[in-house]
């Protein structure tokens, strides 16, 4: 029996509005009804939590009200969107998936998605 595999894209470029989206897919060894997804950011050797959501299979992901993350789920795929990103937020974003219920518990950690964020150039003043 192997660790639960979590797949995510290697690289994503955030939009000019600071929005990045990627898919986090997990190979579920069992029929989970309650799943927890956490997005972690690794910069240097530090890993910090970006956001987390627990959801019942078939239902929407619910992040905290002022979370910078939103997401939807479909089967064993979670579509994650991170908003409000700036150049300083460039880094490795790791998807962590936990099958919380029913037992047994499974934990899978992805290899991370490198998100590149480029701050837009300020618009030059125009005469119009």
């Amino acid at each position: 029996c192997k660790a639960m595999h979590v797949a995510q894209p290697a690289v994503v470029l955030a939009s000019s509005r600071g929005i990045a989206s990627f898919v986090c897919e997990y190979a579920s060894p069992g029929k989970a009804t309650e799943v927890r997804v956490t997005v972690l950011r690794q910069a240097d050797s530090q890993v910090t939590e970006v956001c987390a959501a627990t959801y019942m299979m078939g239902n929407e992901l619910t992040f905290l009200d002022d979370s910078i993350c939103t997401g939807t789920s479909s089967g064993n795929q979670v579509n994650l969107t991170i908003q409000g990103l700036r150049a300083m937020d460039t880094g490795l974003y790791i998807c962590k998936v936990e099958l919380m219920y029913p037992p047994p518990y499974y934990l899978g950690i992805g290899n991370g998605t490198q998100i590149y964020v480029i701050d837009p150039e300020p618009c030059p003043d125009s005469d119009f």
Partner: antibody, heavy 117, light 108 residues
């Protein structure tokens, strides 16, 4: 019932080595992340090593990196901690702990390491 | 490193008294777990996912909080609650965290 039984602790000289074992039973060992947590004489709890279910990924804090090696034998349902270049500050009670849905949900009774000069 | 600071380090309460201890995280986390450790025994998971009681935990215990600040409350102190309580993040990357320093609860 989940059962974790540590063994291998003892008195070791400064700079010496020791290997701890943890025999697991009562659950499907090969699907869980496992860890070693130590409790210092001052009663602080410190996570010193963790390993994923198939043994392919290991995690250590900087305090023990390069000196401690965690491993597992899923066929024997056993977790190990190889410790070398031991320091006085490594003296502690070492617990084997299972990382389940709600954090470290099962703990062994602990085995004591004393590093003497 | 996400540092967890528990306060107070030591406290004592009379039987029947309400007890609250806190755990502050230097970085935001979505959930917090609490462990109880009685003298000469192993730690036990006591409260998980911030507010859920582990199996066998009396209903006088409760947990609350969010982001950087969490707390454990005992509505009415009893002698069997004498122990040290440790917090540990329930989300984020578990194997890069340290436990809180603990709150030792004594009875008056």
């Amino acid at each position: 019932d989940v059962k974790l039984v540590e063994s291998g602790g003892g008195l070791v000289k400064l700079g010496g080595s020791l290997k701890l074992s943890c025999a697991a039973s009562g659950f499907t060992f090969n699907i869980y992340y496992m860890s070693w947590v130590r409790q210092t004489p001052e009663k602080r709890l410190e996570l010193v090593a963790a390993i994923n279910p198939d043994g392919g990924n290991t995690y250590y804090p900087d305090t023990v990196k390069g000196r401690f090696t965690i491993s597992r034998d899923n066929a024997k349902n056993t977790l190990y901690l190889q410790m070398s270049s031991l320091k006085s500050e490594d003296s502690a009670l070492y617990y084997c702990a299972r990382y389940g849905g709600p954090g470290f949900d099962s703990w062994g009774q602990g085995t004591t390491l004393t590093v003497s000069s | 490193e996400n540092v967890l600071t528990q306060s107070p380090a030591i406290m004592s309460a009379s039987p029947g008294e309400r007890v609250t201890m806190t755990c502050s995280a230097s970085s935001s986390v979505s959930y917090m777990h609490w462990y109880q450790q009685k003298s000469n025994t192993s730690p036990k998971l006591w409260i998980y996912d911030t507010s859920k009681l582990a199996s066998g935990v009396p209903g006088r215990f409760s947990g609350s909080g969010s982001r950087n600040s969490y707390s454990l409350t005992i509505s009415s102190m009893e002698a069997e609650d004498v122990a040290t309580y440790y917090c540990f993040p329930g989300s984020g990357f578990p194997f890069m965290y340290t436990f809180g320093g603990g709150t030792k609860l004594e009875i008056k």
